[in-house]
């Protein structure tokens, strides 16, 4: 007998063909021999089955000797063996209806787990294979679990259910609620304006919640809340902002903050958290601020950086157009009795300049 797999909520068409291409008597029955539909004269008639309001036939193909049964809005309990009686012969078709759903909301925070549950008819033994948008393959039986969702898991998951060498494909849209970046670092010279941006990795029609930026300055013993804000339907309103520094925040997404000037006392790390309405847990993004200062005091030319820098970063003092250079994998470099001219202080990572500050040394007579 023929096996057909269907998807819960979908429509399936079971086919039955007569040997002659002409309109003739036919009946579709279920395994209990209850008539579902058939032909009487030129008209479609329906029997007393539970399917009667969801069953139909493609009448346009009757005169081609094709007597299909279409079942709409499939249910798991529609799984059965259906019998087509035509020209004194019987054709059996086994219909197996499967459903695949996410156990929880399909909008999940990064780090949360996703469980997909397969609904299947009794007696079936299907296997499920799911592929994430990022190409991750997961296999399972009645349930499939993804323990810790990552940003790249956002998008359409394609799941294939296999039974009796037949397959049916499900597509489930999963939205991982996260910031686009887990961490970002801003490099600034002292006195420059600082802009922090926190773009989200998803879009929602209605986005409501509240957030806060906590800041741990390198020079401070404890962290401090710099700003708290509300988000209502994608509109940002500031609730409380510290007096020092006096941050400004944009009223539109993406979340955007400006610091009037980069100062050594602000250098450090921040953690922006966003709690979304009706969601447990918070979205996080780390942001770092590195500040550079180049100064000349008496016979000493110094370049310093504050903030979270990796040990592999190099700090250099270099006289423009000359070979004179002093470099260190440290947070401060200095030159005693520097030559007159334009000196450059450079913070670099494997040759790539991250931050540069120029200071003019005037000759001392």
């Amino acid at each position: 007998k023929k096996v057909v797999l269907g998807k819960k909520g979908d429509t399936v068409e079971l086919t039955c063909n007569a040997s002659q291409k002409k309109n003739t008597q036919f009946h579709w029955k279920n395994s209990n021999q209850i008539k579902i539909l058939g032909i009487q004269g030129l008209f479609l008639t329906k029997g007393p089955s539970k399917l009667s309001d969801r069953a139909d036939s493609r009448k346009s193909l009757w005169d081609q000797g094709c007597f299909s049964m279409i079942i709409k809005n499939l249910k798991i309990e529609d799984s059965d063996t259906y019998i087509c009686e035509v020209e004194n012969k019987k054709e059996e078709v086994e219909l197996l209806v499967f459903g695949l759903t996410a156990n929880s909301d399909t909008h999940l925070l990064e780090g949360q787990s996703l469980t997909l549950t397969l609904e299947s008819p009794p007696g079936s033994s299907p296997s499920v294979k799911c592929r994430s948008p990022g190409g991750k393959n997961i296999q399972g039986g009645r349930t499939i679990s993804v323990p810790q969702l990552e940003r790249q898991d956002s998008g359409t998951w394609t799941c294939t259910v296999s039974q009796d060498q037949k397959t049916v494909e499900f597509k489930i849209d999963i939205v991982v609620l996260a910031f686009q970046k887990a961490s970002s670092t801003v490099y600034k010279k002292e006195g420059e304006q600082v802009e922090f941006s926190f773009p989200l990795a998803f879009t929602l029609e209605k986005l409501t919640g509240s957030g806060e930026l906590w800041w741990q300055a390198e020079r401070a013993s404890s962290s401090k809340s710099w700003i708290t804000f509300d988000l209502k339907n994608k509109e940002v309103s500031v609730k409380r902002v510290t007096q020092d520094p006096k941050l400004q925040m944009g009223k539109k997404l993406p979340l955007h903050l400006t610091l009037p000037q980069a100062l050594p006392q602000y250098a450090g790390s921040g953690n922006l958290t966003l709690a979304l309405e009706a969601k447990t847990g918070k979205l996080h993004q780390e942001v770092n601020l590195v500040v550079m200062r180049a100064t000349q005091f008496q016979e000493n030319l110094t370049c310093e950086v504050w903030g979270p820098t990796s040990p592999k970063l190099t700090l250099s003092l270099k006289l423009e157009n000359k070979g004179a250079t002093v470099s260190k994998q440290a947070k401060a470099v200095w030159v005693l009795n520097p030559e007159a001219g334009m000196w450059q202080c450079l913070l670099s990572d494997s040759g790539q300049v991250l931050l540069e500050s120029n200071i003019k040394v005037v000759p001392t007579w």
Epitope: Q193, E195, K232, E235, V236, S237, V238, Q248, M249, G250, K251, K252, H256, T258, P260
Partner: antibody, heavy 117, light 107 residues
């Protein structure tokens, strides 16, 4: 046609009060933030106040805080500005404006408020 | 509050000229800036929103550019009806702030 029509302007003595109204038509009023902007004679534009769709959030320029109140009646498609303790420097044309979220896009013709003894 | 500095305050030009007006924010405001045109006795009219998007119905000779702190309104070829006062508006956060205005006059 999308339209905003202001009314309620006039001459008032310093310390007096006035209530400006704005009738909106041609768009779904309850879906937009609304704004008042003013312009003193011969001067530039000054944003005065904003109100959210449901009236739950209101913002004011510092110079009018505590004296002016912005409000709305979505059932009547109307925006209001209650102005108390008026000063000579409040003399201006007051415009009712629709805030499209990314711009102040539709402006009324304005109503003149003169504060003078 | 973030300050907006518009320049020049006045400008003389002729029909057919290319004209540029600038607006500078005291702090970064992304692209949250609009440009308006106002003629005497009339309400302002929106020309450009989100720094560079042309408002529907506005002639393509008007264009906007910039982001962060520096913004520009350009009229590629002045027409007689373009002589008016132009204002920039920061709608990055509250309070909204207008520039001081640029009066564009016929030379």
């Amino acid at each position: 046609e999308v339209q905003l029509v202001e009314s309620g302007g006039g001459l008032v003595q310093p310390g007096g009060s006035l209530r400006l109204s704005c009738a909106a038509s041609g768009f779904t009023f309850s879906s937009y933030w609304m704004t008042w902007v003013r312009q003193a004679p011969g001067k530039g534009l000054e944003w005065v106040a904003n109100i959210k769709q449901d009236g739950s959030e209101k913002y004011y320029v510092d110079s009018v805080k505590g004296r002016f109140t912005i409000s709305r009646d979505n059932a009547k498609n109307s925006l209001y500005l209650q102005m108390n303790s008026l000063r000579a420097e409040d003399t201006a044309v007051y415009y009712c404006v629709r805030d499209r979220y990314d711009a102040l896009d539709i402006w009324g013709q304005g109503t003149m408020v003169t504060v003078s003894s | 509050a973030i300050q907006m500095t518009q320049s020049p305050s006045s400008l003389s030009a002729s029909v057919g000229d290319r004209v540029t007006i600038t607006c500078r924010a005291s702090q970064g405001i992304r692209n949250d800036l609009n440009w308006y045109q106002q003629k005497p006795g009339k309400a302002p009219k929106l020309l450009i929103y989100a720094a560079s998007s042309l408002q529907s119905g506005v002639p393509s000779r008007f264009s906007g550019s910039g982001s962060g702190t520096d913004f520009t309104l350009t009229i590629s070829s002045l027409q007689a009806e373009d002589f008016a006062t132009y204002y920039c508006l920061k709608d990055y956060n509250y309070p909204y702030t207008f520039g001081q205005g640029t009066k564009l006059e016929i030379k």
